[in-house]
Interface confidence: low
């Protein structure tokens, strides 16, 4: 019988709240001292009279206040994230598609387009998407290269998304960019084909714009027998989403609560 | 007497390892089903015979393998991070210093230099530094601006560090850039003055290079009575470091273990 | 850190991550998960012997804090610290699915 | 989430974050911390009533997992989830120091 065994692990006995508070307070006494590596509170004999110096208060406030661009402590996992995510992938539209024609000539950029009907098949509603990654297989790279990722915005305009500093490498390596927000936008809009641009980083005073990095799916003059591998390893979107039926189940159980 | 109370909270009874394993296994049974929102295992009646399709295996492997640029789960806090950090700040060298003279004319950039002797006073050894932030007070901004931060590298070369997309704002706002690695480098080197550059982001095909954002410490024509506030709010490095004596204590206790 | 590197190679009696491999077929009687065949779930076990008493010398307690009660809890408990996800492949009807389950593998434990 | 917004305004008996304000002078008898005068340390308390038995219907258990045993522990425990740091100002001799103490304020709890 498991019942007796159960008691060995049970901690749900009646607990005296005041005792717990007292223990917590005493634990904090030790915690603060131990974090400061002090065996006992520091002597206050030499502390100058009067208020704290302005500079010290300013420093204390800088430390206390969170500012734009500073990352907060990790957020608790939202309820929806507890449940499993279905994983799918959508390959980039192949480069012989006519959409690429007007972008072919650039030395500083490569373009990657995706069919939104395939995306919608994988993720019927934007709210279901929990993560989307753009994955690219970079081939050998002789020199360090700083690249930037852009999203196609309207007509011929591009919106900056992120950047990456690529170290030289003798072997192929997968790169991943988080594009969750962008893919969520695409799922909400009516467009048929949407895309990204990977560009060399150009600083304001430098004119060296050539994209040196070789991304699988774009290189030419390959041996025919490599074509299949090459095609399967072209850029793709890796999608993680809550399946529709689970999402509905999740909503109805949330309503029942 | 506290002793009796103590027993209410104690959980350090002898525990049957096999029972715990059995409970954990049964808990996992429920956990997997609940994460998949299944009340019972799915029927296998319609599963096609033979191995899994190649595409499914490829997708499974993509999910299983971690790739460059994908963030891992948060790392456990290293032992050294458990202990308190001393917080100090080092203000930027004032703009009337001669170091700025050769950089004054640029429309796309502003420059910020720091005295490394002040940094070394705050953090005597590079290994003690746990975090360094460059903090800038941005004033009102009428249009969205994409800015980049660079580190002065050698002679007249600059190394890209990070970027930020600044939204328009009617009120001043502190910006923070994590520059821990850079400051650690500076502490290891012999230079007297080191610096950063904040520049407008220039894409390869656009030539709009003007830095629109106004950073406190660089604007001119201020009323005299604002000078002090303005001076104190000029860019600074906020440093968090293990005090030298605590670090030594930490090392000796690590050796004793 | 109370992680697999330390705990699996030591005889630590206090809070530590303990080895546990789950074979879906053998341990759970499941044939429906096609990949993987099983996984290293692991679990946390062991007391967090936090010394608490009004008359204990603090100098003795301080060194134990980081390991045994870093969160200054009234009754510290041995729980997972670092967790990793698990992708699985299974069928719904004739359709294969790849799904990722979050926080399935215990990599390290802590007294919290 | 078992956070301050939910727990401080409810009468939840199970695992939840509980209010605890520490006044350094009154509660610890300390005058040496000059800023702040105290802080909301809070703490986690309450059972994690995970139903475990070979004959329990799984359909009944599933709904309880997320709240009461998301980590599939053999004996889930109520512990901090989100923590925040605390900066303090104190003197060493004549010299004021600002230091940041990590993981001092409990913002939410979880059964782990």
């Amino acid at each position: 019988d498991y019942k007796d065994d159960d008691d060995k692990l049970s901690t749900s006995k009646t607990i005296d709240m005041e005792l717990v508070k007292r223990k917590r307070i005493e634990a904090i006494r030790g915690q603060i001292l131990s974090k400061l590596r002090l065996a006992s509170p520091p002597s206050q004999g030499e502390v100058p009279p009067g208020p704290l110096p302005e500079a010290v208060l300013a420093l204390y406030n800088s430390t206390r206040d969170r500012v734009a661009g500073e990352s907060a402590e990790p957020e608790p996992e939202p309820e929806a994230d507890y449940y499993a995510k279905e994983v799918t992938r959508v390959l980039m539209v192949e480069t012989h598609n006519e959409i690429y024609d007007k972008f072919k000539q650039s030395t500083h950029s490569i373009y990657m387009f995706f069919n939104t009907s395939e995306l919608r098949e994988a993720v019927p509603e934007p709210v279901l998407l929990s993560r989307a990654e753009l994955r690219l297989l970079r081939l050998k790279l002789k020199v360090e290269q700083h690249v930037e990722l852009y999203q196609k915005y309207s007509n011929n305009s591009w919106r900056y998304l992120s950047n990456r500093l690529l170290a030289p490498s003798d072997s192929p390596e997968w790169l991943s960019f988080d594009v969750t927000g962008v893919v969520r936008q695409w799922l909400s809009r009516g467009g048929e084909i949407e895309g990204f641009r990977l560009s060399a980083h150009c600083s304001c005073d430098s004119r060296d714009n050539t994209l040196q990095v070789d991304i699988n799916g774009f290189t030419t003059g390959r041996r025919g027998d490599l074509a299949t591998i090459h095609g399967m390893n072209r850029p793709f979107l890796l999608l993680m989403a809550t399946p529709l039926e689970r999402a509905q189940h999740l909503q109805s159980s949330r309503h029942r609560r | 007497d506290y002793k009796d109370d103590d027993d209410k909270l104690s959980t350090s009874k002898t525990i049957d390892m096999e029972l715990v394993k059995r409970k954990r296994i049964e808990a996992i049974r429920g956990q997997i089903l609940s994460k998949l929102r299944l009340a019972s295992p799915p029927s296998q009646g319609e599963v096609p015979p033979g191995p899994l399709p190649e595409a499914v295996l490829a997708l499974y492997n993509s999910t299983r393998d971690r790739v460059a640029g994908e963030s891992a789960e948060p790392e456990p806090e290293p032992e050294a991070d458990y202990y308190a950090k001393e917080v100090t700040r080092v203000l930027m060298v004032e703009t009337h210093n001669e170091i700025y003279d050769k950089f004054k004319q640029s429309t796309h950039s502003i420059y910020m230099f720091f005295n490394t002797s002040e940094l070394r006073e705050a953090v005597p050894e590079p290994v003690l530094l746990s975090r360094a932030e460059l903090r800038l007070l941005r004033l009102k901004l009428k249009v969205e601006q994409h800015v980049e931060l660079y580190q002065k590298y050698s002679n007249n070369s600059w190394r890209y560090l990070s970027n930020r997309l600044l939204a328009p704002s009617d009120s001043p706002e502190w910006l923070s850039f994590d520059v821990t690695g850079v400051v650690r480098q500076w502490l290891s080197r012999g230079g007297e003055i080191e610096g950063f550059r904040l520049s407008a982001h220039c894409s390869c095909d656009s030539r709009d290079n003007t830095l629109q954002v106004d950073i406190n410490g660089f604007t001119t024509g201020r009323r005299g009575d604002l000078a002090t506030i303005h001076g104190m709010n000029r860019p600074f490095l906020l440093l968090m470091a293990t005090p030298l004596e605590r670090a030594q204590h930490l090392q000796s206790s690590r050796h004793r273990r | 850190a109370l992680d697999t590197n330390y705990c699996f190679s030591s005889t630590e009696k206090n809070c530590c991550v303990r080895q546990l491999y789950i074979d879906f077929r053998k341990d759970l009687g499941w044939k429906w998960i096609h990949e993987p065949k099983g996984y290293h779930a692991n679990f946390c076990l062991g007391p967090c012997p936090y010394i608490w008493s009004l008359d204990t010398q603090y100098s003795k307690v301080l060194a134990l804090y980081n390991q045994h009660n870093p969160g200054a809890s009234a009754a510290p408990c041995c729980v997972p610290q670092a967790l990793e996800p698990l992708p699985i492949v299974y069928y719904v009807g004739r359709k294969p699915k790849v799904e990722q389950l979050s926080n399935m593998i215990v990599r390290s434990c802590k007294c919290s | 989430a078992l956070d301050t917004n939910y727990c401080f305004s409810s009468t939840e008996k199970n695992c939840c974050v509980r209010q605890l304000y520490i006044d350094f002078r009154k509660d610890l008898g300390w005058k040496w911390i000059h800023e702040p005068k105290g802080y909301h340390a809070n703490f986690c308390l309450g059972p994690c009533p995970y139903i475990w038995s070979l004959d329990t219907q799984y359909s009944k258990v599933l709904a309880l997992y997320n709240q009461h045993n998301p980590g599939a522990s053999a004996a889930p425990c109520c512990v901090p989830q989100a923590l925040e740091p605390l900066p303090i100002v104190y003197y060493v001799g004549r010299k004021p120091k600002v230091e940041q103490l990590s993981n001092m304020i409990v913002r939410s709890c979880k059964c782990s």
């Epitope: - | 009120s171 | - | 301050t4 401080f8 006044d23 009154k26 702040p36 005068k37 105290g38």
Partner: antibody, heavy 122, light 108 residues
């Protein structure tokens, strides 16, 4: 059960003084920041001031000369001393518990008493 | 002191209507802004703090937005129990606590 009960209101002549009390129960009073707010008949809310756990007070500019806030933690009681009263001080006076979950924002009124009416009239 | 200017001072609406009340601060207060509801003969009740955080137990039809100087309280679908007076409040520090003059929501 958190409770705040104001008392000490009533009719008072112009130029005289009055002391209002606010009795707190159901929570750890000495750990909480407390506020006084008033509301003239048919008008909006006016913040008078606040007292922190340590006894530090903040008051609105208009209240600084004549109004004093104090507390007695041993009695779980908050006080508002009003001097040189005028007809325009006629109002319902509320005490309210501060909400200090974010560090320094003690001025969100999380829990209010029912109020006590002060009428200044000759 | 910071002045909080609320508009409109009163409005008439029907059950089911979407109602919006705005509040303007005389200087930037970041998101240190709260909204209260008051019914006749009762003390005010906290609805929203930090400009957009819903107080526990407040129905989700209430929402708040804004930062800096401009703030909005929205009731997505007015219910019979929502007819009351609403006040905004700034609380960025002890020298800038102030209430708006109130907005009375009446039955049309």
């Amino acid at each position: 059960q958190v409770q705040l009960v104001e008392s000490g209101g009533g009719v008072v002549q112009p130029g005289r003084s009055l002391r209002l009390s606010c009795a707190a129960s159901g929570f750890h009073f000495s750990n909480e920041a407390m506020n006084w707010i008033r509301q003239p008949p048919g008008k909006g809310l006016e913040w008078i001031g606040y007292i922190y756990t340590s006894g530090t007070t903040y008051r609105s500019n208009w209240a600084r000369g004549r109004f004093t806030i104090s507390r007695d933690n041993s009695k779980n009681t908050l006080y508002l001393q009003m001097n040189s009263l005028r007809a325009e001080d006629t109002a319902v006076y509320y005490c309210a518990r501060g909400w200090h979950i974010f560090g320094h924002q003690y001025w969100v009124m999380h829990f209010w008493g029912q109020g006590t009416l002060v009428t200044v009239s000759s | 002191d910071i002045q909080m200017t609320q508009s409109p001072s009163s409005l008439s609406a029907s059950v089911g209507d979407r109602v919006t009340i705005t509040c303007q601060a005389s200087q930037s207060i970041s998101t240190y802004e709260a909204w209260y509801q008051q019914k006749p003969g009762q003390p005010p009740k906290l609805l929203i703090y930090a400009a957009s955080t819903l107080e526990s137990g407040v129905p989700s039809r209430f929402s708040g937005s804004g930062s800096g100087t401009d703030f909005t309280l929205t009731i997505s679908s007015l219910q019979p129990e929502d007819f009351a007076t609403y006040y905004c409040q700034s609380y960025s520090d002890g020298d800038s606590v102030g209430f708006g003059q109130g907005t009375k929501v009446e039955i049309k």
